[in-house]
Amino acid sequence: EICGPGIDIRNDYQQLKRLENCTVIEGYLHILLISKAEDYRSYRFPKLTVITEYLLLFRVAGLESLGDLFPNLTVIRGWKLFYNYALVIFEMTNLKDIGLYNLRNITRGAIRIEKNADLCYLSTVDWSLILDAVSNNYIVGNKPPKECGDLCPGTMEEKPMCEKTTINNEYNYRCWTTNRCQKMCPSTCGKRACTENNECCHPECLGSCSAPDNDTACVACRHYYYAGVCVPACPPNTYRFEGWRCVDRDFCANILSAESSDSEGFVIHDGECMQECPSGFIRNGSQSMYCIPCEGPCPKVCEEEKKTKTIDSVTSAQMLQGCTIFKGNLLINIRRGNNIASELENFMGLIEVVTGYVKIRHSHALVSLSFLKNLRLILGEEQLEGNYSFYVLDNQNLQQLWDWDHRNLTIKAGKMYFAFNPKLCVSEIYRMEEVTGTKGRQSKGDINTRNNGERASCESDVLHFTSTTTSKNRIIITWHRYRPPDYRDLISFTVYYKEAPFKNVTEYDGQDACGSNSWNMVDVDLPPNKDVEPGILLHGLKPWTQYAVYVKAVTLTMVENDHIRGAKSEILYIRTNASVPSIPLDVLSASNSSSQLIVKWNPPSLPNGNLSYYIVRWQRQPQDGYLYRHNYCSKDKIPIRKYADGTIDIEEVTENPKTEVCGGEKGPCCACPKTEAEKQAEKEEAEYRKVFENFLHNSIFVPRPE
């Protein structure tokens, strides 16, 4: 019997009865938060062989082993994972061993076994036989191995029953408990599973089988299960589902899961029955079960219940992530915030259409509206009083609407209104009228020429660069000396520069009024000599990197009511010179014969130019006679290898550490102080543990059901 779509057993151990007839759990299995120690011996679920997602155990008092509960659990598929893990055993106070002696395969994901104070038999399990990669396993904070004294079956009687494998250079017996070995298949089976009698299973079997070479006798399937048979692919008119079985179209059409209830139902795509069309695809019609490729970014319609969505923080903007069509009105009211422009672009940058109006008011943190980088249509189906569909009021730092050279925006219905935007030049507003097709709709008072742009240098002159010189990490630029009508109005220049791999940056990228700015800024004073052109040396740059640079004249803002002229340059793109590359990474050498060495390496992390070739140098080294002075057949450890540069590999002290004379003074050696890298690694480790624990708590603590 297939049980699903995930089983959560908590608070009451008797809920375990729900597993009684399950052979496959299609989904996850949670057993957690059972605080009263119970006797679990009467609970046994021998039918359960496969969990398609993950197994999570957390704070189950009194449970000493999983072997009696799940004696035949063979495969955890890891189709969906719990924070990258397919098996999580966390804070199981009484667990003494894992004991899942029939667990043969964790198809995807790693394991996390942490903070189980009584848990032993961890070092006796060879996880590499169960998982593809053991490097992501996290086994920390359990009972120290020295206190465990793990013994595999028959070891005491000197009749060991289990097989040996090597883990971390230790060749040892592998077992789950004192009386259960870890099963290994004969090498003749290769990657195939085997029966209890060591006969090889059919190649489509995973984990184990009840009869050899029979695709109907598998405990679990390597690929897909259909009508009692393990198959490499789903037959015609059936579709892959949940990563393990084949279902028909009707089944797929009728799925109503808690996770997918808001969607339009499951879809069939690329031979799979799935919850939504994958990235880059959209349904072929609103109620279709089939997907077609999107042209450009896939549309995602978002609707606001209350008709008007107020964006007053990053959190409120977050709700619009991925939306391309917004059904309703946008009211933007961003008074403050950290790194606000790029955050808003991240969450609102895909919006192409707003069906109602857009109102930007009291948004003192905004310098530009370029964060709405894909907005192309305001329908104006709903308008503000006075028939306004684009309304911009009292934004103290707003300087740019959009980069009109690269922007097509249409306002289908309604008028525009601009007032009290002191840094927004009227010319910018008039340009918007032309682009959006609203010219002629506005009445005289809708665009206030007195209080828009009153504190800005609106009639800009163009500053021209006169020379550029580059080296590997420096750029020297000079520009024409700017002469405003009254020379006293010119205070200084500001040079803006940043890395720009592509020639597509604008002045307002990532800029807001709260100090965030993706541009580096350098102030340049006027040269005292009137004949000398102003210039700057930008240093500390990266070799072979393209930079964008522009210069602005800093001028007095206002003389009474006259708008004063400002000046700035076009954006200049300039690349620093190439330099010596950093060293090649991960150099490995191995000998494949008595006269050849194979050397491999990865490219340098900083090529600092276009790499054209590598130089490989080698030289013959004299053989170290020290190597011959050790009997390699003895059980003692191989001696420490001494290296020419004076550094040595510190051998981990195992038994009977001897006190040695160090540094000319008597006394034991002290542990070396931790390096910065080690300290950083420890810090990251602690942080990672916290993040996981938070994730665990957030995932499993839910309000009590009604």
């Epitope: 699903g4 799925i255 109503l256 209830s261 009604e706």
Partner: antibody, heavy 117, light 112 residues
Framework: QVQLQESGPGLVKPSETLSLTCTVS?????????WNWIRQPPGKGLEWIGY???????NYKPSLKDRVTISRDTSKNQFSLKLSSVTAADTAVYYC??????????WGQGTLVTVSS | DIVMTQSPLSLPVTPGEPASISCRSS???????????LQWYLQKPGQSPQLLIY???NRLYGVPDRFSGSGSGTDFTLKISRVEAEDVGVYYC?????????FGQGTKVEIK
Amino acid sequence: QVQLQESGPGLVKPSETLSLTCTVSGYSITGGYLWNWIRQPPGKGLEWIGYISYDGTNNYKPSLKDRVTISRDTSKNQFSLKLSSVTAADTAVYYCARYGRVFHDYWGQGTLVTVSS
Amino acid sequence: DIVMTQSPLSLPVTPGEPASISCRSSQSIVHSNGNTYLQWYLQKPGQSPQLLIYKVSNRLYGVPDRFSGSGSGTDFTLKISRVEAEDVGVYYCFQGSHVPWTFGQGTKVEIK
């Protein structure tokens, strides 16, 4: 693989409350789907009574709304029907069934409830 | 409530001959999402109902292709191209587009 099993008294006295339970195995009732009660008076057609959804919300047939309650016990993976003030007209085979996005895909085998004194 | 009216209520058939059952709804059963949730169920004697056709014309996987459904708006039809002995039972139409969901009163198909 999903199984539904109705249980409850086969005989109820008039004016009393009819109580039935549907035990679901093979699928968690909180995981999705709409969990329905449907009845069929002897020799007559099928009549939809109502459902409880995976998230606990209900929908009832308006003519029965004042007398019917469908509830659930998530720890036992069961949902229940209570029909108060029964009369002989409530004598029927009562089915529990699962409804997805489009149709009923699993039905119980039905249990006959007779209303008689 | 939407009333589903089936005709005929009884349909004696000869094996190998075609049969047709009509189902009319008292109002349109097109859902707001554009789908028409009209199903046909067969209830064999002593059994629970089993689904044959969903969303007007989609035959359930495993149902013989002699069964077909058609119609739109308020008028729907179930056709059996060649009746077989195992097709006897009561056929119900059902609408799941508007709550309360409703069944037709049933059409009894029996062999002549």
